[in-house]
Interface confidence: medium
């Protein structure tokens, strides 16, 4: 046969399922093959790419007495804590031979509730001078909506509605509490409370 | 069987854009890095960039930075690489090729010759 | 980026003879992983797509002739043509595929 096709003689009888999750999740893919004679070394692929570094196991179960009998292998690739980096396209790969065999492919996706890249900090200000407070949060799912908060009060009638990343507070009189809510199609996730605190004139 | 379909040639008008086309038939298209290569005249092979149409991922050549843009089709199987602002420097054979994990691309289109000419 | 340099850039040769040419890459291209050399031999006829002779530095790609033999490892490697043929009138390209791709110049073989 042609070197790297994929036709009938692919040897993957398993092929990596699908993981979707929140962030911290832990899930495990698995390809399972049968081959003639030695057991090659299963490879995983991300988006193409040989993963050089993965953590996975591989398990080889001889299916008669010789040496060139079949054998069933197992490879399994743990994905622990999952991150935005950790998404794509999961493949096997092995080389038999001078051929090439790849497995159909498997997807890990990230999916849950917002996740705050920046969330607001306490400080310290002059009375009746104008600051401005950050918070930024991403998904997946996408779009994540901001609503501010001001001693528990919305600052806007809906999230998306006001101010985003960048909130605008033109000056304080007394000590104050502000904190972002991050809104997407999974739900809602709060940011830590930053207390702005006032000094006297 | 495996093939990667281009069209035989283009003319272009200097300072235009072009849209080169690859279509792919015969395995899992979204499995396999689609790879870009410019042939001048007389010169050898520069590689310009790929592009893994699973995700849409690219890599470029810095040479060719500002002058490719790689895409993907995934409903039609056909990746395209889009080439700016053109001059005669640009009027070469351009070929995609198919890339085979464990290093080399298995099959390879039959290039398109792209004239850049008023 | 790896660079590839290929020699020489031509030569000229009566059929039945031997030949070798050389081409050197700026950095290893053993996956120690995979235990592969990640680098191709093409061979290149005038308005023709280049076609795979060898891969993984000393693998003959089905259907190529036994005369064709690539050899080397890490940086240093060899395409051999033990005994040329009047067909083989082309330009021989190696490539590198460790990290994306890379093109020697090319080594243009010519029948006496």
């Known amino acids: 046969a042609p070197r790297g096709t994929q036709a009938e003689e692919s040897p993957f009888v398993g092929n990596p399922g699908n993981i979707t999750g929140a962030r911290g999740l832990t899930g495990t893919l698995r390809c399972q093959l049968q081959v003639q004679g030695e057991p090659p070394e299963v490879h995983w692929l991300r988006d193409g790419q040989i993963l050089e570094l993965a953590d996975s196991t591989q398990t080889q179960v001889p299916l008669g007495e010789d040496e060139q009998d079949d054998w069933i292998v197992v490879s399994q690739l743990r994905i622990t804590s999952l991150q935005l980096s950790d998404t794509g396209q999961y493949q096997c790969l092995v080389f038999l031979g001078h051929q090439t065999f790849v497995s159909q492919p498997g997807y890990v996706g990230l999916e849950g509730l917002p996740y705050f890249l920046e969330e607001p900090e306490d400080r310290t200000v002059a009375a009746n001078t104008p600051f401005n407070l950050s918070c930024q949060a991403q998904g997946p799912p996408e779009p994540v909506d901001l609503l501010w908060l001001q001693d528990a009060v919305p600052l806007a009638t809906a999230p998306g509605h006001g101010p985003q990343r960048s909130l605008h507070v033109p000056g304080l009189n007394k000590t104050s509490s502000f904190s972002c809510e991050a809104h997407n199609a999974k739900g809602v996730t709060t940011s830590r409370t930053a207390t702005i605190t006032v000094l006297p004139q | 069987q495996v093939q990667l379909q281009q069209p035989g040639a283009e003319l272009v008008k200097p300072g235009a854009s072009v849209q080169l086309s690859c279509k792919a038939s015969?395995?899992?298209?979204?499995?396999?890095?689609i790879n870009w290569v410019k042939q001048r005249p007389g010169q050898g092979l520069e590689w310009m960039g790929n592009?893994?149409?699973?995700?849409?991922?690219?890599n470029y050549n810095e040479k060719f930075k500002s002058k490719a843009t790689l895409t993907v089709d995934k409903s039609s199987s056909t990746a395209y690489m889009q080439l700016s602002s053109l001059t005669s420097e640009d009027s070469a054979v351009y070929f995609c090729?198919?890339?085979?994990?464990?290093?080399?691309?298995?099959?390879w289109g039959q290039g398109t010759t792209l004239t850049v000419s008023s | 980026d790896i660079v590839m340099s290929q020699s020489p850039s031509s030569l000229a040769v009566s059929a039945g003879e031997r030949v070798t040419m050389s081409c050197k890459s700026s950095?290893?291209?053993?996956?120690?992983?995979?235990?592969?050399?990640?680098l191709a031999w093409y061979q290149q006829k005038p308005g023709q797509s280049p076609k795979l002779l060898i891969y993984?530095?000393?693998t003959r790609e089905s259907g190529v002739p036994d005369r064709f033999t690539g050899s080397g490892s890490g940086t240093d490697f060899t395409l051999t043509i033990s005994s040329v043929q009047a067909e083989d009138l082309a330009v021989y390209y190696c490539?590198?595929?460790?990290?994306?791709?890379?093109f020697g110049g090319g080594t243009k073989l010519e029948i006496k």
């Open positions: 993984w530095a000393s």
């Open positions: 490539k590198q595929s460790y990290n994306l791709w890379t």
């Open positions: 592009i893994f149409p699973g995700s849409s991922s690219t």
């Open positions: 950095q290893s291209l053993l996956n120690t992983r995979t235990r592969k050399n990640y």
């Open positions: 090729a198919r890339d085979y994990y464990g290093g080399s691309p298995d099959y």
């Open positions: 015969g395995y899992t298209f979204i499995s396999f890095w």
